[in-house]
Interface confidence: medium
Amino acid sequence: ELCDDDPPEIPHATFKAMAYKEGTMLNCECKRGFRRIKSGSLYMLCTGNSSHSSWDNQCQCTSSATRNTTKQVTPQPEEQKERKTTEMQSPMQPVDQASLPGHCREPPPWENEATERIYHFVVGQMVYYQCVQGYRALHRGPAESVCKMTHGKTRWTQPQLICTGEMETSQFPGEEKPQASPEGRPESETSCLVTTTDFQIQTEMAATMETSIFTTEYQ
């Protein structure tokens, strides 16, 4: 199931995925002056089996004599819902990216690709936020957002991050910490990505729920 909307916007912050869940689509977009080759794919698709995931299809751009009129593909699933596209600033390759089951790594750049990548995320996808250059991160909780679904309606959880206008950059999980840092940061914030993006739940689990009751009378 594709996510209806884009991940939430945090002022002075950008987000990225460390790995992409199977089913994720990446539009084959070309930079100005280039277009997708006629026989080329509209998008790349993260597919795989139990042991290995990879991107199907290859994006190819060719020079265009006319203005770039490449259509943006918005995949329509069975439900025919309108899907918004998600823009990613120039692709950033995380350092030592964890190899998660059922996930693809950041696809390598293709020749003459557009400066922005447009992903179509699926339910269960997690993205991580960092403050842009010149802003410092204040964490009230995890600086991440997950796409979840309730009765077929998708939503992104709200990342607990505020970026303040102080000169210090915040890092994505798995990225190198700057040499000089005005204040010590917990090691956990810069450690490699943990496998929290795998949302498969055992269907055979025994779930129990006990309810109890309290009442309060107004005096």
């Epitope: 269960g124 309730t150 309606k153 607990q160 949302f199 739940i201 779930a207």
Partner: antibody
Framework: PGATVKISCKVS????????MHWVQQAPGKGLEWMGL????????IYAEKFQGRVTITADTSTDTAYMELSSLRSEDTAVYYC????????????WGQGTLVTVSS | QPVLTQSPSASGTPGQRVTISCSGS????????VYWYQQLPGTAPKLLIY???QRPSGVPDRFSGSKSGTSASLAISGLQSEDEADYYC???????????FGGGTKLTVL
């Protein structure tokens, strides 16, 4: 009537924060009425218009317990209240509690 | 008054095929998935169909769901006495921003 009731729902057998927690009302001999939900991961709630302002749904991740508080009780609130979980990847309320009967009488 | 409309009752004989319908609008069934729940007498509801036509593990293939426009149907083939229950349809409603249920259909196996 006029009182507030708070029902708790303790779960086990799965990771509490991976599922939404819904609350559903069923008056005697009547159908199901959705009251609202909480996402235990971030505490975000969505309430049904009918119960807005009278219902508060919360989740305590330290005890894997969800709560539903209904205020300004009236006789028509006499019902069985179910807590029920929904897989956030599949959708659909797939595990239901046994229900708690609340009787409002003067 | 329930947002989704179901006929209050339906009946059939063992082995027969029965269909329960659920009617909504463009803001619920028309643009979102439909879910079906079975409530046996004196018990909590149970998820029967999700995402219009998918069966959770453990639900017999005698139960099938379908959707067309702003209406949905639950079909039960090879009716059995243990299928006697109340059946509810549900969907997300974009206008109300929440889950809406049908009024329920009481199925009697004659």
């Amino acid at each position: 009537p006029g009182a507030t009731v708070k029902i708790s729902c303790k779960v086990s057998g799965y990771t509490f924060t991976d599922y939404y927690m819904h609350w559903v009302q069923q008056a005697p001999g009547k159908g199901l009425e959705w009251m609202g939900l909480v996402d235990p991961e971030d505490g975000e709630t969505i309430y049904a218009e009918k119960f807005q302002g009278r219902v508060t749904i919360t989740a305590d991740t330290s005890t894997d317990t969800a709560y539903m508080e209904l205020s300004s009780l009236r006789s028509e609130d006499t019902a069985v209240y179910y807590c029920a979980t929904e897989d956030t990847a599949m959708g659909g309320i797939d595990y239901w509690g046994q229900g708690t009967l609340v009787t409002v009488s003067s | 008054q329930p947002v989704l409309t179901q006929s209050p009752s339906a009946s059939g004989t063992p082995g027969q095929r029965v269909t329960i319908s659920c009617s909504g609008s463009s803001s619920n069934i028309g643009s979102n998935y439909v879910y079906w729940y079975q409530q046996l007498p004196g018990t909590a509801p149970k998820l029967l169909i999700y995402s219009n036509n998918q069966r959770p593990s453990g639900v017999p293939d005698r139960f099938s769901g379908s959707k067309s426009g702003t209406s949905a149907s639950l079909a039960i083939s090879g009716l059995q006495s243990e299928d006697e229950a109340d059946y509810y349809c549900a969907a997300w409603d974009d206008s109300l921003n929440g889950v809406v249920f049908g009024g329920g259909t009481k199925l009697t196996v004659l």
